[in-house]
């Protein structure tokens, strides 16, 4: 029998320092570009190798960005969100939502040597 797929949603504050080529990621979403059904939020679609975000390591593709330097990203046009990042300054604080997929299988006996974590 297959297990149910659930999601564990966590929030995190990520402080990035703008690198020589910027923050180093792409975004999708906005009120005029809904990437997720019934959600006009802003999502990370790509993290550039060796960019500031990649070197920091916490921001992940698929993360939802809730705010930038305390400014809410709700109900923004796509380009307005892009411009907000571009004008965010050298030190950029991101409030992000991670959505981790959790496989809930049938409960079974944990055998010897199985991870107990």
């Amino acid at each position: 029998m297959n297990g149910r797929v659930d999601y564990l949603v966590t929030e995190e504050e990520i402080n990035l320092t703008r690198g020589p080529s910027g923050l180093g990621f792409n975004i999708v979403g906005g009120t005029d570009q809904q990437y997720v059904s019934n959600d006009s939020g802003i999502y990370v679609s790509r993290i550039k190798e060796n960019g500031a975000a990649a070197l920091d390591g916490r921001l992940q593709e698929g993360d939802k960005i809730l705010s930038v330097n305390g400014q809410d990203l709700k109900n923004l046009l796509h380009q307005d969100a892009v411009d907000l990042f571009r004008n965010a300054g050298y030190a950029v604080s991101l409030r992000v939502q991670h959505r981790l997929q959790v496989q809930n299988g049938p409960i079974g006996h944990r055998g010897e040597g199985d991870p107990s974590g």
Partner: nanobody
């Protein structure tokens, strides 16, 4: 995974026009940034033009002569090339990456910014 197929290349006389097309697979085409690059024999691949959700960018060598546009309903990006010159002769490649860069749009001039590439279409401009 996105697949890109270019078409529209050919042989044209200097001063003439061509329109290149790049058809993309995928349901979320509108969220992709699309670019055109070209590579002449013995030269490096060079940036030509790019279009995001709401911005366009051109290399200085084609500005005023070439126009990039997209039709999200048809999953296609176009490169209208006017006033062609012999130095425009090259293989033209379509490229794609999901999303818009949060950094200056100028980052789109580098090929490392793109994840998907077409096979290319040959454009030859004779004098």
């Amino acid at each position: 995974q996105v697949q890109l197929v270019e078409s529209g290349g050919g042989l044209v006389q200097a001063g003439g026009s061509l329109r290149l097309s790049c058809a993309a697979s995928g349901r979320t085409f509108s969220t992709y940034t699309m670019g055109w690059f070209r590579q002449a024999p013995g030269k490096e691949r060079e940036f030509v033009a790019a279009v995001t959700w709401s911005e366009t960018l051109y290399s200085d060598s084609v500005k005023g002569r070439f126009t990039i546009s997209r039709d999200n309903a048809k999953n296609t990006v176009y490169l209208q090339m006017n006033s062609l010159k012999p130095e425009d002769t090259a293989v033209y490649y379509c490229a794609a990456v999901q999303g818009s860069p949060v950094d200056t749009i100028v980052v789109l001039t580098t090929s490392e910014e793109y994840d998907y590439w077409g096979q290319g279409t040959q454009v030859t401009v004779s004098s």
